[in-house]
C-alpha cells in the first residue's frame, strides 16, 4: 500500500529507515518557490513555514475568480511530495514556502530573483543547516536567472529545478539550463518519459536525471486530508528535492558536486525508451531515473564520474564547443562527437584557472560536441601533457612522466582539414602502457592525475565487420574516465561515455566501405580509487 | 549548460552624444540588452539592470539614481521597484523601452534583461 512513485525511488532497504539526523531532528530546510500553499493540510501541517514572501504578477482576465483551494493547488501538492507525512519522500523535513506564482501558476523572472535573494538574506541573517531550494517553474532562457542560481549554489545551497513540460530541449529554459542546478525530467510508472497532452517532459544535455512525474499522489488543497494526483516535471523535481533532503539529513556535509554525482551513480540506468526523444537529443539525454542512494559510509570511497556535453558548436569552419565540469570536479578526459564525422578533434585547455574540454569543427562539418568526463577525485593533482603534431608518417607519444601520475584520458586534435589523409589516433595499452599515441598531423593531449590510491588501466574492444558503434565497458568496481575511438574506418563520428560504457561511433558510409582488416576500436580508460594503495597503472 | 541558446541579445550601442552630457559621451555602451525568445512570455516595460560583479552597494544605488535623473531630463518617469544586493548587483526598473539605450550606457552596467513570465510545471 505504498504509492508507485515512492516504491520506485526508495529502494526496499530504505523504506523503514527514519529520515532523521542522529539527534532525532532533521536540520535540512527545503525552500519551495511556487504558488501559495495550504499549511493546514495534514500531510504538511507542522512542517511548513509559510513565509510572508509574495512576489507575483496580477492574474489575467477581468473575470478571474480567486478560489483559495485552486490558488494553493500546485504548491500544496509539491510540499506534500517533498515532506508529506504519508506520500512524501523526506517525511521529516521542514519546508518554507515563498509565493512566486499566482493563482494561475504564473510568475516572473524578477519575482523569482527576489525570492532567491530572500533566501540568501535569510541565510545571512540566520545561518542554519543544509538548504535545498526547489524551483518547480520554468520560463524562457534567462541569463540573470541562471546567474542568480549560480551565485546561490556557490554559497552552498542545493537548487533543484523542473526541466520543463514543453517536450523541448531543457537548455532553452531557465532555471533548467543553469549548470549549477540539478535539473529533473519526468518519467511515468513504466519508467518512460511523461507525455502531457501534446507536450511532455523536456530533455537534452541540461537534464541531469529523471524522476517520477506522472500521476503522483500528493496533498490536495481541496481539503485538509485530501489527496489528488498531479503530473509534471515539478513533481519529478520535488522527488529529487526530497531525495537530496534525505541525503543531507544523513550527511549534512555533502556538497552539490557530491550530491549530483551520487544521484547519477545510484540512479536506475537504461530503463527509459530513448526513442521518445528527438533523434538528435537521444545521445545527449541521460537515461537515468533517480533513486535514494545509500550513505557514503555504506559505499566507501568510490570514484564517481559523470559525462557533461557541451552545447552544439554550430557549423562554421572554426566553430568550437566547450564542456565544463563543476568547480569541485576534475576533468579527467575530453572527447568529441560530430554527427557528420567532420571534426578536428578535442583538447583540454585552462580558461580562467579551470580546465575545460574543447572540440573543433572541421570544414564542411555540421558542428561538434565536446564531451567532458567530470569526476570526484579526492585530493587529486591533475595536469595536461601535450605534444605537437609529428611529421608525416610518424607517431606522437605522450605519457604521464611525473612520478605516481596515471593516465586518465587522451585527446587528439588534428591540424589538417583533409580528413582523408589522417589516421585516427591510438591508445596502445599492451605495447606502451599508459601512453596516448597520435598519428599524422595530430596533437596529442594526455590527462594525468595523482591521487591517493588511484589506479587506471586501458580496456579495448574492436569490431572488424560493419557496425554503427563499438562499445567497451569498465568492469564492476572500476569507473570509466576516458573514452576514445582508435584506428579503423577513415571516418568516425567520435566517442563519448554513457555511464560506465565507452561508445565509439562510426559513420554509416565508413561502415559500408570498410575492409575486414580495419577494426574500429573503442578504448576505455578505467580507474578506481583504493585509498590504501599507491597510484598505479594496471597492465 | 549555460550557453545562451534560443535567446535574443540585442546590442543597443546608441550614439553617446545623444545626451549631450560630458560624462556620458565618454562611455560607449558595451552592455547588451536581452529578452526572452518567446514573444508571448515577455514583459516589456520591466527590466532587470545587471551590474558588473564587483559593483559596490553604494554604486548600485547611484546607478539606479543616475538612471532616474537622466530619464527625468528627457521627461520620463521611471520607477525602481527593487534593488538587488545579496545575490548579484542590480536593480529592477519599470520604464519605457525608449530609455534602454540610455540605461545601457550607464557605468557598471553589464547587461539589461527584459522581465518575462515563468510558469508552474
Amino acid at each position: 500500500s505504498i504509492p508507485w512513485n515512492l516504491e520506485r525511488i526508495i529502494p526496499a532497504w530504505h523504506q523503514t529507515e527514519e529520515d532523521r539526523s542522529p539527534d532525532g531532528s532533521s536540520q535540512v530546510e527545503v525552500y519551495l518557490l511556487d504558488t501559495s500553499i495550504q499549511g493546514a493540510h495534514r500531510e504538511i501541517e507542522g512542517r511548513v513555514t509559510i513565509t510572508d514572501f509574495n512576489s507575483v504578477p496580477e492574474e489575467d482576465g477581468t473575470r478571474f475568480h480567486r478560489q483559495a483551494s485552486k490558488c494553493d493547488s500546485h504548491g500544496t501538492h509539491l510540499a506534500g511530495v517533498v515532506s508529506g507525512r504519508d506520500a512524501g519522500v523526506a517525511k521529516g523535513t521542514s519546508l518554507h514556502s515563498l509565493r512566486v506564482l499566482n493563482c494561475q501558476g504564473k510568475g516572473t523572472v524578477s519575482g523569482t530573483l527576489i525570492g532567491l535573494e530572500f533566501i540568501r538574506k535569510s541565510q545571512l541573517i540566520q545561518p542554519s543547516g543544509p538548504l535545498v531550494v526547489l524551483l518547480p517553474l520554468a520560463g524562457g532562457y534567462s541569463r540573470i536567472l541562471n546567474a542568480a542560481c549560480r551565485h546561490l549554489a556557490r554559497t552552498g545551497v542545493v537548487l533543484v529545478a523542473a526541466a520543463g513540460n514543453f517536450r523541448d530541449d531543457a537548455c532553452l529554459y531557465s532555471p533548467a539550463s543553469a549548470p549549477e542546478v540539478i535539473t529533473v525530467g519526468a518519467t511515468n510508472a513504466q519508467d518512460q518519459p511523461v507525455t502531457l497532452g501534446t507536450l511532455g517532459t523536456n530533455f537534452g544535455r541540461c537534464v541531469d536525471l529523471f524522476a517520477p512525474g506522472k500521476d503522483i499522489i500528493g496533498a490536495s488543497s481541496d481539503c485538509s486530508t485530501c489527496f489528488m494526483s498531479q503530473s509534471g516535471t515539478s513533481q519529478a523535481a520535488a522527488h529529487v528535492a526530497g531525495i537530496v533532503a534525505r541525503m543531507l539529513s544523513r550527511e549534512p556535509t555533502l556538497t552539490l558536486a557530491e550530491l549530483r554525482q551520487r544521484l547519477i551513480h545510484f540512479s536506475t540506468k537504461d530503463v527509459i525508451n530513448m526513442a521518445w526523444f528527438p533523434e538528435d537529443q537521444q545521445v545527449l539525454t541521460p537515461n537515468l531515473v533517480a533513486t535514494l542512494p545509500p550513505s557514503t559510509h555504506e559505499t566507501g570511497g568510490q570514484l564517481l564520474c559523470r559525462t557533461v556535453w557541451s552545447a552544439h558548436s554550430g557549423p562554421t569552419r572554426t566553430a568550437t564547443a566547450t564542456a565544463r565540469c563543476a568547480p569541485e570536479e576534475e576533468l579527467l578526459s575530453c572527447s568529441s562527437f560530430s554527427r557528420s564525422g567532420r571534426r578536428r578533434g578535442d583538447w583540454i585547455e585552462a580558461i580562467g584557472g579551470q580546465q575545460v574540454c574543447k572540440a573543433l569543427n572541421a570544414f564542411g562539418g555540421e558542428g561538434v560536441y565536446a564531451v567532458a568526463r567530470c569526476c570526484l577525485v579526492p585530493r587529486a593533482n591533475c595536469s595536461i601533457h601535450n605534444t605537437p603534431a609529428a611529421r608525416a608518417g610518424l607517431e606522437t607519444h605522450v605519457h604521464c612522466h611525473q612520478k605516481d601520475h596515471v593516465l586518465t584520458g587522451c585527446s587528439f586534435h588534428w591540424e589538417v582539414e583533409d580528413l582523408s589523409v589522417r589516421r585516427q589516433p591510438a591508445l596502445r595499452s599492451r605495447r606502451q602502457p599508459g601512453q596516448c599515441v597520435g598519428h599524422q598531423a595530430a596533437s596529442v593531449y594526455a590527462s594525468c592525475c595523482h591521487a591517493p590510491g588511484l589506479e587506471c588501466k586501458i580496456k579495448e574492444h574492436g569490431i572488424s565487420g560493419p557496425s554503427e558503434q563499438v562499445t567497451v565497458a569498465c568492469e564492476a568496481g572500476w569507473t570509466l574516465t576516458g573514452c576514445n575511438v582508435l584506428p579503423g574506418a577513415s571516418l568516425t563520428l567520435g566517442a563519448y561515455s554513457v555511464d560506465n560504457l565507452c561508445v565509439a561511433r562510426v559513420h554509416d558510409t565508413a561502415r559500408a566501405d570498410r575492409t575486414s582488416g580495419e577494426a574500429t576500436v573503442a578504448a576505455a580508460i578505467c580507474c578506481r580509487s583504493r585509498p590504501s594503495a599507491k597510484a598505479s597503472w594496471v597492465q | 549548460q549555460d550557453e545562451d541558446g534560443d535567446y535574443e541579445e540585442l546590442m543597443l550601442a546608441l550614439p553617446s552624444q545623444e545626451d549631450g552630457l560630458a560624462d556620458e559621451a565618454a562611455h560607449v555602451a558595451t552592455a547588451t540588452f536581452r529578452r526572452c525568445s518567446k514573444e508571448a512570455w515577455r514583459l516589456p516595460g520591466t527590466y532587470i539592470v545587471v551590474l558588473m560583479e564587483e559593483t559596490q552597494r553604494l554604486q548600485i544605488e547611484q546607478t539606479a539614481h543616475r538612471l532616474q535623473t537622466r530619464a527625468a531630463r528627457r521627461g520620463y518617469v521611471i520607477k525602481v521597484l527593487h534593488i538587488f544586493y545579496d545575490l548579484f548587483p542590480g536593480f529592477l526598473v519599470k520604464m519605457s523601452s525608449d530609455l534602454l539605450g540610455l540605461a545601457l550606457k550607464l557605468p557598471h552596467v553589464e547587461y539589461i534583461e527584459e522581465d518575462s513570465f515563468v510558469f508552474a510545471q
Epitope: 500500500s1 495534514r42 507525512r85 485538509s224 | -
Partner: antibody
Framework: QLQLQESGPGLVKPSETLSLTCTVS??????????WSWIRQPPGKGLEWIGS???????YYNPSLKSRVTISVDTSKNQFSLKLSSVTAADTAVYYC??????????????????WGQGTLVTVSS | EIVLTQSPATLSLSPGERATLSCRAS??????LAWYQQKPGQAPRLLIY???NRATGIPARFSGSGSGTDFTLTISSLEPEDFAVYYC????????FGGGTKVEIK
Amino acid sequence: QLQLQESGPGLVKPSETLSLTCTVSGGSISSASYYWSWIRQPPGKGLEWIGSINYRGSTYYNPSLKSRVTISVDTSKNQFSLKLSSVTAADTAVYYCARENSGVVPAAGPNWFGPWGQGTLVTVSS
Amino acid sequence: EIVLTQSPATLSLSPGERATLSCRASQSVSSYLAWYQQKPGQAPRLLIYDASNRATGIPARFSGSGSGTDFTLTISSLEPEDFAVYYCQQRRNWFTFGGGTKVEIK
C-alpha cells in the same frame, strides 16, 4: 474484522494527565493506508476530534487542544495511546478511538472515521 | 474553525415517515461532509461520506445531498432502528462535527 478497544482509568483528578490506550485487533496498525484517531463526546453534547497518528508516529492534532495533547503509537503491541495534560472538568467525556483512511491509497476506502471503539467514559473530578 | 450547525435539534416522526435533516457550514466545505448515526451507548457509525456516497452496508433509504455550505440527510421511510442521533462532520479544514439532530418517535 477490525475492532478497536479503549482502556484506561475512568477517573482523573483535575490538573493531572489523562492517559488512554486503544488496542487494535483483527488487523495491523502498521499500514500506510490509515490514521488512528481519538474523538471525544462530553455527556449530552456533540463530538470533538482530538488528534490522529499514523504507524510511523506522525501526529496531527486539533489546534484548540494541541498544547495539551500527545498521541503515540506502539506497533509491536498494535496499540496507540492518548495523553491529555492539565485536565479540568470540561475534559469529562466519553473518549472514542477510531480508524481513519489516510487517503493516500484510494482503494483503502473513504477518507472518514470508522470503525470506532465502543468508547470509555473518563470523569475529571477531585 | 469551520462551524457546522444542524437543524432541527430534535425531529419527532413516526415510522414510515420521511426525515429531512439539515447541516449548514460556516464556510464552504465543498463536498467534504459525512453523516454519522449514533444510538444510545454506542459509537457513531458512518452512513454517508463525501456528501452523497453511501458507506458499505448502509440501506438505500439513507441519502445525502448538497455541496458548499448546505447539506441534507434524507431518510425516505423511517424504520424503528433509525431513531437515533445524527451528526454531520466536515474535513475541508481539520475535522469538526455538528451538534447533532435527534430523531425520536412521535
